[in-house]
C-alpha cells in the first residue's frame, strides 16, 4: 500500500483517469479522450485537454498593437487529431472531410479546404499576446507589482521559466502579458507558451484544469484582479496563409 | 529528436520464448528510464515491465512476473525483454517507452512503433 495508492490523482490536469497499476503501485494517468499517458508533474499540452474536453459532457500607446499576421482563435472548440507526443497533427480534419492547417496552439492558419489539403509541417507560435481588461478599482494598479505577481504566476503555478515570460504592459483597465518562446530556446521539460496560456486562459474564466486546487485568485498587494474580458492573440513563426477575400470580409 | 527502435517480434508456440530488442537515440540513455508497454487489440496499453536507468531496479506487474525479465546495456543504447513461458493472452504489440517514475507517479513519454508477438496455441 503506497501514497500514490491513497492519493491517485493528476495534480496537474483533471480531465483524467488514475489508477494506482504502475510499476511498485504507482499511480499511472491518461487523459480522457485520447487515453494518453499524461506526465502530472507538468502541464498537459492543450491538444490533449482540448481532445478531452470534447470527450466530456458538454457544458500615445504602451500597450502592443497586435501586427497583422496576429490569429485570434474564433473557431472555437474542435475535437483535434494529436501526435504520439501530444501535440497538435499540422492538418485537422472534421466529420465532414473539411480540412485546415493549424499552429502549435491548434489555432486555424489556413483557409478551410478537403482532403487534398496538404499541411506540410507543424507551424510553431513563438509570441503570444494575452489581452485583458479588468474590472473597475478604486485606483490603477502598481505597475511593478502587477508586473510581480503575473510574472510569479506563470512561474509557480504554470511552471513557466521567466525568460519566456518577455513583458507584461498595463493602461489601467488593459493589461497585456508578452509570452516569447522560439524553437531554439524550448529546452526539453520546458513548459510550452501554448500549454501556459490555455491553462491561464481556462482559470480566468473559471475553469481551472488543475485538481482540487481551489480556482485563480488573483491579488496585487492584497487588492483583487477581476478579470472582465479576455483575448489572447497568436504570433506563427510563418505567417498565416488566408485567402484575400478572408482578410477583406 | 527520441527515436526507439524495437525489434524480435514474431509468432511462437504456447509455452515458447522470444527476446525482444530496442535500439534507443536522440536522447541520453544511460540516464533514463525505460519501460516495456503492450497493447493488445481492442485494449488499452498495459506496461509490462520497468526497468531505471543504472539497471538496479525492476518492476513487473503480476500477469507477467516470473516469465518476463527486462534488462539493458547502456554502452550499447539498447533495451531488452525476454519472455519465456508464453501465454495467448501475451499476443500484442510490443512497444519499449522511456518513463518517469516519481514517489507517487509513473508516466511513459516516448513510445517506439513497436513489434508485433503472436502466440499461438
Known amino acids: 500500500h503506497t501514497a500514490a495508492q491513497d492519493n491517485c490523482t493528476c495534480p496537474t490536469n483533471k480531465m483524467t483517469v488514475c489508477s494506482p497499476d504502475g510499476p511498485g503501485g504507482r499511480c499511472q494517468c491518461r487523459a480522457l479522450g485520447s487515453g494518453m499517458a499524461v506526465d502530472c508533474s507538468t502541464l498537459t499540452s492543450k491538444c490533449l485537454l482540448l481532445k478531452a474536453r470534447m470527450s466530456a459532457p458538454k457544458n500615445a500607446r504602451t500597450l502592443v498593437r497586435p501586427s497583422e499576421h496576429a490569429l485570434v482563435d474564433n473557431d472555437g472548440l474542435y475535437d483535434p487529431d494529436c501526435d504520439p507526443e501530444g501535440r497538435f497533427k499540422a492538418r485537422q480534419c472534421n466529420q465532414t472531410s473539411v480540412c485546415w492547417c493549424v499552429n502549435s496552439v491548434g489555432v486555424r492558419r489556413t483557409d478551410k479546404g478537403d482532403l487534398s489539403l496538404r499541411c506540410d509541417e507543424l507551424v510553431r507560435t513563438h509570441h503570444i499576446l494575452i489581452d485583458l481588461r479588468h474590472r473597475p478599482t478604486a485606483g490603477a494598479f502598481n505597475h511593478s507589482d502587477l508586473d510581480a505577481e503575473l510574472r510569479r504566476l506563470f512561474r509557480e503555478r504554470y511552471r513557466l521559466h521567466p525568460k519566456f515570460v518577455a513583458a507584461v504592459h498595463y493602461e489601467q483597465p488593459t493589461i497585456q502579458i508578452e509570452l516569447r518562446q522560439n524553437t531554439s530556446q524550448k529546452a526539453a521539460g520546458d513548459v510550452d507558451i501554448g500549454d501556459a496560456a490555455y491553462y491561464f486562459e481556462r482559470d480566468i474564466k473559471g475553469e481551472s484544469l488543475f485538481q482540487g486546487r481551489g480556482g485563480l485568485d488573483l491579488r496585487v498587494r492584497g487588492e483583487p484582479l477581476q478579470v472582465e474580458r479576455t483575448l489572447i492573440y497568436y504570433l506563427d513563426e510563418i505567417p498565416p496563409k488566408f485567402s484575400m477575400k478572408r482578410l477583406t470580409a | 529528436q527520441v527515436q526507439l527502435q524495437e525489434s524480435g517480434g514474431g509468432m511462437v508456440q504456447v509455452g515458447g520464448s522470444l527476446r525482444l530488442s530496442c535500439a534507443a537515440s536522440?536522447?541520453?540513455?544511460?540516464?533514463?528510464?525505460m519501460s516495456w508497454v503492450r497493447q493488445a487489440p481492442g485494449k488499452g496499453p498495459e506496461w509490462v515491465s520497468y526497468?531505471?536507468?543504472?539497471?538496479?531496479?525492476?518492476y513487473y506487474p503480476d500477469s507477467v512476473k516470473g516469465r518476463f525479465t527486462i534488462s539493458r546495456d547502456n554502452a550499447k543504447n539498447t533495451l531488452y525483454l525476454l519472455m519465456n513461458n508464453l501465454k495467448p493472452e501475451d499476443t500484442a504489440l510490443y512497444r519499449c517507452?522511456?518513463?518517469?517514475?516519481?514517489?507517487?507517479?509513473?508516466?511513459?513519454?516516448?513510445w517506439g512503433q513497436g513489434t508485433q508477438v503472436t502466440v499461438s496455441s
Open positions: 517507452a522511456r518513463a518517469k517514475l516519481t514517489d507517487t507517479h509513473y508516466v511513459e513519454d516516448y
Open positions: 526497468i531505471n536507468a543504472d539497471g538496479s531496479k525492476t
Open positions: 536522440g536522447f541520453p540513455f544511460s540516464s533514463a528510464d
